[in-house]
Interface confidence: low
């Protein structure tokens, strides 16, 4: 790595993957193992994130980018960048301080994470319930009761939604 020749900041020419080494007369030195610099002109390299325990490595650290973690099976990521792993529950459940609990009547959760939410109130939109809700699925709203006169064409309910895959948030 050659010394930079910038008249302003001698470190500005140090590319990503290097740092401006004050101990070596501001020469651009490569980041040491298990560290990285994602932008040029940095005076230090950042320590790579380590994916340990319930975290597993999704992308290895390189000299120019940090490692990325996700969660081992049975857990899912929380927070931007997967800062925490939280236990999965089944669809129709939510995670409480006492573990996974079934959704109360009138609420549902169609994911393996997150909280149970109330069923949609079809009547607020002047509609009727076409398909009843369950612990795993929201209700399906259909036409307003007035539209369902004898002889009106029947409405086919949608096919059941497939199980969502999952590595959310």
């Amino acid at each position: 790595f050659e010394r930079t020749r910038s008249l302003q900041d001698p470190c500005s020419n140090c590319p990503a993957g290097t740092f401006c080494d004050n101990n070596r007369n501001q020469i651009c030195s490569p980041c040491p193992p298990n560290s990285f610099s994602s932008a040029g002109g940095q005076r230090t390299c950042d320590i790579c994130r380590q994916c340990k325990g319930v975290f597993r490595t999704r992308k290895e650290c390189s000299s120019t980018s940090n490692a990325e973690c996700d969660c081992t099976p049975g857990f899912h990521c929380l927070g931007a960048g997967c800062s925490m792993c939280e236990q999965d529950c089944k669809q129709g459940q939510e995670l409480t301080k006492k573990g996974c609990k079934d959704c109360c009547f009138g609420t549902f959760n169609d994911q393996k994470r997150g909280i149970c939410r109330p069923w949609t109130n079809c009547s607020l939109d002047g509609k009727s319930v076409l398909v009843n809700g369950t612990k795993e699925r929201d209700v399906v709203c259909g036409p307003s009761p007035a539209d369902l006169s004898p002889g009106a064409s029947s409405v086919t309910p949608p096919a059941p939604a497939r199980e969502p895959g999952h590595s959310p948030q």
Epitope: Q111, R117, A161, R162, G165, S167
Partner: antibody
């Protein structure tokens, strides 16, 4: 990352569909949102679509917008744009904290 | 309809100082804690800072602190840096998949 596309200049009443595409993760695993921001204004929430395809809208947005999804994209249809709908439209992922946002796509409605 | 009010449209404080941004909800947010905070700089997309009222998003410095429950929430930024100059939005979630943003508070760092 997320990327919105489809924003352009349209005349009032001309339907427009915006598309959100993901790279680096599977869209189908996430609840996805649409949010808009008029020039110089704050953020305005439009609606959310669940991983199983159920869409929920802000009260002001019902009937004016339709959110749908495929395994690889999430779409926002502006059914009958008015000049009031001129804004940057963002898609964002997550249902209890939107941790990833697109850069936005500008929709201008003008006659 | 649910309304989130950020009382101050702008606040300012010196570098190294502390600012507090309040967000008041007209109704209790879902689960008492379904509230997020976002930072947005001009011409940029919003960035998640806090979710579940007080949980710090990944990569966000611990200088940012969210607190509150039910209808009253606060974002506190301590040890202010020039880079914190931005507009901050709260966002609440309510029963029935209703989400609302506050009007935003602009933070000026002197």
């Amino acid at each position: 990352s997320l990327e919105e596309s489809g924003g352009r200049l349209v005349t009032p009443g001309t339907p427009l569909t915006l598309t959100c595409t993901a790279s680096g993760f599977s869209l189908s695993n996430y609840y996805m949102n649409w949010v808009r921001q008029a020039p110089g204004k704050g953020l305005e929430y439009i609606g959310i679509i669940s991983s199983s395809g159920s869409a929920y809208y802000a009260s002001w947005a019902k009937g004016r917008f339709t959110i749908s999804r495929t395994s690889t994209t999430v779409d926002l249809r502006i059914t009958s744009p008015t000049t009031e709908d001129t804004a940057t439209y963002f898609c964002a992922r997550g249902d209890y904290g939107m941790d990833l946002w697109g850069q936005g796509t500008l929709v201008t409605v003008s006659s | 309809a649910q309304v989130l009010t950020q009382t101050a449209s702008s606040v300012s404080a010196p570098v190294g100082g502390t600012v507090t941004i309040s967000c008041q909800s007209s109704q209790t947010v879902y689960n008492n804690n379904l509230l997020s905070w976002y930072q947005q700089k001009p011409g940029q997309r919003p960035k998640l800072l806090i979710y579940y009222a007080s949980t710090l998003a990944f990569g966000v410095p611990s200088r940012f602190k969210g607190s509150g429950s039910g209808t009253e929430f606060t974002l506190t930024i301590s040890d202010l840096e020039c880079d914190d100059a931005a507009t901050y939005f709260c966002q609440g979630g309510y029963s029935g998949w209703i989400y609302v943003f506050g009007g935003g508070t602009e933070v000026e760092v002197k």
